[in-house]
């Protein structure tokens, strides 16, 4: 039975998800849509993604590992609207790792999820990036320019932002 196998598939997906996230918050996105769109309960949601601000201070590599354990990645920012949503939940006196790095120090920036790096959709502070040895990107607040990106040394502990796709149940 098609409906039965669909239900079984949905429940097993839910069980797998709840190994990492014991509680979900779900929203009805439209009147005729049967599925709920869900994020883990402490996470926030924007469009088709869920976001979590990790306040523990860790290196870029450990921050990415922390996100991946939760089924997420360090955040990949695709639009100005997405960044405007994210910054509502950040503290001005903190810096947060993004899922953006330049492993070879050659200014070949790459996103953790292989999204192509598009120079036209970047939000670097003026004068940044400015150091070939600073191979990881953060987002932080500067009074002159508000929120923007900066390159820093990857081993310096920072807070971070995780992003994952919503689950539909």
């Amino acid at each position: 039975n098609f409906m039965y196998s669909k239900t079984v598939k949905r429940l097993s997906k839910l069980r797998e998800y709840q190994q990492y996230h014991p509680s979900l918050t779900c929203v009805m996105e439209g009147k005729d849509i049967e599925d709920w769109s869900c994020c883990p309960t402490p996470w926030t949601s924007f469009q088709s993604s869920c976001y979590f601000i990790s306040t523990g201070m860790q290196s870029w590599t450990k921050s990415q590992k922390n996100c991946s354990v939760m089924g997420a990645d360090l955040v990949v920012i695709n639009t100005r609207e997405e960044q405007d949503f994210i910054i509502q939940n950040l503290k001005r006196n903190s810096s947060y790792f993004l899922g953006l790095s330049d492993p070879g120090g050659r200014r070949h920036w790459q996103w953790v999820d292989q999204t192509p790096y598009n120079e036209n959709v970047t939000f670097w502070h003026s004068g940044e990036p400015n150091n070939l040895d600073e191979r990881c990107a953060i987002i932080n607040f500067r009074s002159s320019e508000e929120w923007g990106w900066n390159d820093i040394h990857c081993h310096v502990p920072q807070k971070s932002i995780c992003k994952m796709k919503k689950i539909y149940i």
């Epitope: 839910l14 709840q18 014991p22 509680s23 979900l24 918050t25 779900c26 009805m28 849509i33 049967e34 599925d35 709920w36 869900c38 309960t41 149940i169």
Partner: nanobody, 123 residues
């Protein structure tokens, strides 16, 4: 026979808060999803929020997410709806509902209803 009894409604100013309670009698409560609906005179009853039997899944309609919080206490057979930042458009009769399943789809209809409690938000 399961009975659902709402309380906590009233008149509140826009921007204010209210907490609705729904006490359930009978054995349905602990293994059923529970929810809240609301109805404005002359309109159909609409879903507001629901909670799975063990509180692991919280369900909301988009217009209340971030303002309303649903919770339950299985020891007290009670489900709550904490409403904050209330708006004039939240004015309605609020109904407690019990489902015949532990989790729900957006299309799942409740099997039990309370009598309703009036919430009026003045602007």
């Amino acid at each position: 026979q399961v009975q659902l009894q709402e309380s906590g409604g009233g008149l509140v100013q826009a921007g204010g808060s209210l907490r609705l309670s729904c006490a359930a009698s009978g054995r349905i409560f602990s293994n059923s999803a529970m929810g809240w609906f609301r109805q404005v005179l002359g309109k159909e009853r609409e879903f507001v929020a629901a909670i799975s039997e063990n509180s692991s899944i919280l369900y909301y309609t988009a217009s209340v997410k971030g303002r309303f919080t649903i919770s339950r206490d299985n020891d007290k057979n009670t489900v709550y709806l904490q409403m904050t930042s209330l708006k004039a458009e939240d004015t309605a009769v609020y109904y407690c509902a019990g489902y015949g399943s532990t989790t729900i789809r957006t299309t799942t209809r409740p099997t039990k209803w309370g009598q309703g409690t009036q919430v009026t938000v003045s602007s």
